[in-house]
Amino acid sequence: TSHLVKCAEKEKTFCVNGGECFMVKDLSNPSRYLCKCQPGFTGARCTENVPMKVQNQEKAEELYQK
């Protein structure tokens, strides 16, 4: 089984554009990293800009779910 832990201070720059870094702890595999991106960004390292249209759509869905 695997679980997520917040990255150590020295690993935080794995993600760009202010993305939050997490490490996937998995006993059977080497550690790997994931990014939780800030609004407006996406991609493995949060490098990609989310088009405005998509951002608005996501906000609308968020509000609907609330």
Epitope: E9, T13, N17, G18, A44, R45, T47, E48
Partner: antibody, heavy 116, light 107 residues
């Protein structure tokens, strides 16, 4: 041991094309982030392009957008920089580098000279 | 794009001196600031990343500090092999941008 070896540089005329290669070994290529950085003679460092081999996502500096294409072949552990419509100002040593938490490993560089 | 400004552009120092190089970003880059050392004809070498994290294998006389827009690289006791050019780089957002470099020369 991590190794990056660039090749493909040379002399090319303005408007010409060149493809640079960056052969990687000693690490999991598909799990990294590969960047190209260049340095004009006697000048500083300029970031050029990046690719995430795992998903193929790419990014470019405005100065090369539409002219340069970065790609990667995970089966060959090699990244490429296809350079078209070359200009005199593209003359530089081109380095590839891996990025984990910063640009931690660099190749030795390959010189591209654009001149008639 | 984020502009990176290094100072000084060059400095002369003696072996054993304490050397400080500063780097200023045109906007907040949090702690995403790296320092590289480059010797003539060679590729840059990573010294510090995340503003203050020493890269593996780099001597402890090198240290980095700062966050936001103002950063410092310090060499506590300059050694003969430290004479080189040093570059700062923001790695907060693409395009990653470098300072213009600081050349450390022998006095």
């Amino acid at each position: 041991e991590v190794q990056l070896v660039e090749s493909g540089g040379g002399l090319v005329q303005p408007g010409g094309s060149l493809r640079l290669s960056c052969a990687a070994s000693g690490f999991t290529f598909s799990g990294t982030w590969i960047h190209w950085v260049r340095q004009a003679p006697g000048k500083g460092l300029e970031w050029v392009a990046a690719i995430t081999p795992a998903d193929g996502s790419t990014n470019y500096a405005d100065s090369v957008k539409g002219r340069f294409t970065i790609s990667a072949d995970t089966s060959k552990n090699t990244a490429y920089l296809q350079m078209n419509s070359l200009r005199a100002e593209d003359t530089a040593v081109y380095y590839c580098a891996t990025y984990m938490f910063a640009m931690d490993y660099w190749g030795q560089g390959t010189l591209v000279t654009v001149s008639s | 794009d984020i502009q990176m400004t290094q100072s000084p552009s060059s400095l002369s120092a003696s072996v054993g001196d304490r050397v400080t190089i500063t780097c200023r970003a045109s906007q907040d880059v949090s702690i995403s600031l790296a320092w590289y050392q480059q010797k003539p004809g060679k590729a840059p070498k990573l010294l510090i990343y995340g503003a203050s994290n020493l890269e593996s294998g780099v001597p402890s006389r090198f240290s980095g500090s700062g966050s936001g827009t103002d950063f410092t690289l310090t060499i506590s006791s300059l050694q003969p092999e430290d004479f080189a050019t040093y570059y700062c780089q923001q790695h907060y957002t693409l395009p990653f941008t470098f300072g213009q470099g600081t050349k450390v020369e022998i006095k």
